[in-house]
Amino acid sequence: DTHKSEVAHRFKDLGEEHFKGLVLVAFSQYLQQCPFEEHVKLVNEVTEFAKTCVADESAENCDKSLHTLFGDKLCTVATLRETYGEMADCCAKQEPERNECFLQHKDDNPNLPPLVRPEVDVMCTAFHDNEATFLKKYLYEVARRHPYFYAPELLFFAARYKAAFAECCQAADKAACLLPKLDELRDEGKASSAKQRLKCASLQKFGDRAFKAWAVARLSQKFPKAEFAEVSKLVTDLTKVHTECCHGDLLECADDRADLAKYMCENQDSISSKLKECCDKPLLEKSHCLAEVENDEMPADLPSLAADYVESKDVCKNYAEAKDVFLGMFLYEYARRHPDYSVMLLLRLAKAYEATLEKCCAAADPHECYAKVFDEFQPLVEEPQNLVKQNCELFEQLGEYKFQNALLVRYTKKVPQVSTPTLVEVSRNLGKVGAKCCKLPEAKRMPCAEDYLSVVLNRLCVLHEKTPVSEKVTKCCTESLVNRRPCFSALELDEAYVPKAFNAETFTFHADMCTLSEKEKQVKKQTALVELVKHKPKATKEQLKGVMDNFAAFVEKCCKADDKEACFAEEGPKFVAASQAALA
């Protein structure tokens, strides 16, 4: 299905609004430091050019690839060398190396100021004055901070952002209407970004076989009534969509995602009974809805797996004939029977089954060798079950903030070389698993918890890859995607770590602490906690709990004082001295 002009093809398929939005996202994800106005100018130039190609596909340069067109446009930025340093060297390369070079320079932790939310009236005025610019600014600000955000999904977020302002700026109490909606979009957006980052890491670090295995497991859980061939087709199409988006091919990605949604809605009967309400929605909403759709009910009469995968004398013959297809069918059959398992557990079971067949099919009596293969699954299943049970027990005992603190201590002891901001960010997010998953019924706890932890730990891996400091983190992140979480769980105290020297400045606090929001206060205290553990890695949990209780009391006392700064100046050194004595 070749087109004379790729850019004209995508413009016509997507329409001008989506085309412009996606090009803005693409440019913002590549050049994360460029000012908004610069990107808008580039997008307008590309859009005008696309329109000339729509009018005449044979016009000059219309036959060029999108990478060539976009790369050439990015390389016209005058301040490339000053702003991006060695990324400017990408422009000396030819496609496809140039695009690969741009991709490698995407920064998962760009040095950008946190987004400050203006007053509601200020935002509503900006929205009414120039709605188009207001929404473009949203796309730009999110995309540059989240360079792997799933672009077609970001268009959906922008549509919801627009709807929130359109509704709430008319409301009697604008703030009461708008702020909860913006909070929800922010939280959902961060979660969406992190989930997509894991998909891209899976594709880029472990290859499309790893992603396809993940997709087979997840889609088989969602669509247990679908045939294996149907699931395989969806997996192939989904892999193409995510490969494109992760590779910066956002127009192709959005176009193919729309095609996939169309296909699913035209073939609901052979996929799932749960798709109906999604398929009545407009495109962006429909695609989002299909991606988030709940698991269909399992067919009632599914036979035992043992017959085909353990008891049959043809197991080795079937495996040898088409290894990946046979393993794919095993994964499909196991996953559709187990919506109560995490995807990562299902992938571990498939890996264990593969390892057993590799060993046994070369043995003298293969059947005797693999006869007990399902028994070997039991410890693999119990490990995440125990993890979830224990951590939910602790969460229920402590509440979210103190549960996060327990995780901060745990992970700082495991990998004390990791930077304090990273440990705080990752542990706070790990701690959110409690509120998210522990309230769910037993059958939903493990898939919720373990698959969420995989997303959060991927963030640790991505940040650590940028600035590697711990061999243990590198090992857990790179050896096996499916065993990342068990690898981190199994890490013990780092005995080789030399405790960080005490620095009074780290534990000096001022009256500005009192004006911080509750979240910012928590982060301050948690930062101090990490530093404390880095200083005293062998401190017991009881000792650390005592210090943190004293810290909370000290801050509360000084924030109630008439002369807050004087109180911090006087009580701070006493608190530090008492803490050092308690941890001696």
């Epitope: 224990q390 027990e393 017991t540 949990k541």
Partner: nanobody, 124 residues
Framework: QVQLVESGGGLVQPGGSLRLSCAAS????????MGWFRQPPGKEREFVAS????????YYADSVKGRFTISRDNAKNTGYLQMSSLKPEDTAVYYC?????????????????WGRGTQVTVSS
Amino acid sequence: QVQLVESGGGLVQPGGSLRLSCAASGRIFSTYAMGWFRQPPGKEREFVASINRSGDSTYYADSVKGRFTISRDNAKNTGYLQMSSLKPEDTAVYYCAADSDGIGWFNSFEYDYWGRGTQVTVSS
């Protein structure tokens, strides 16, 4: 502080049994989870079994499942590890540990207090 003292170790033949005890003093034992760890000669310390504070959740290493049973008597401030069908690879110093979370974690660093250990040797 919690003080822990292990007892019950010794020399036993393969297939034999032993019962280890862990006597606790100093704090309210029932607020702590208890774990047993072991250190085979020339190897790292490893998790064996744990029991939460109330005694209703128990956890075992795969290598001992079905052979060892952990239990506790909060009234006596004592924990136990019943070991049966012992194998030569069970030879190690066995340590009792207390976890202030009350959960019974698998990682040794989660435990605040440790006993000095008791030697178990399985040999014919």
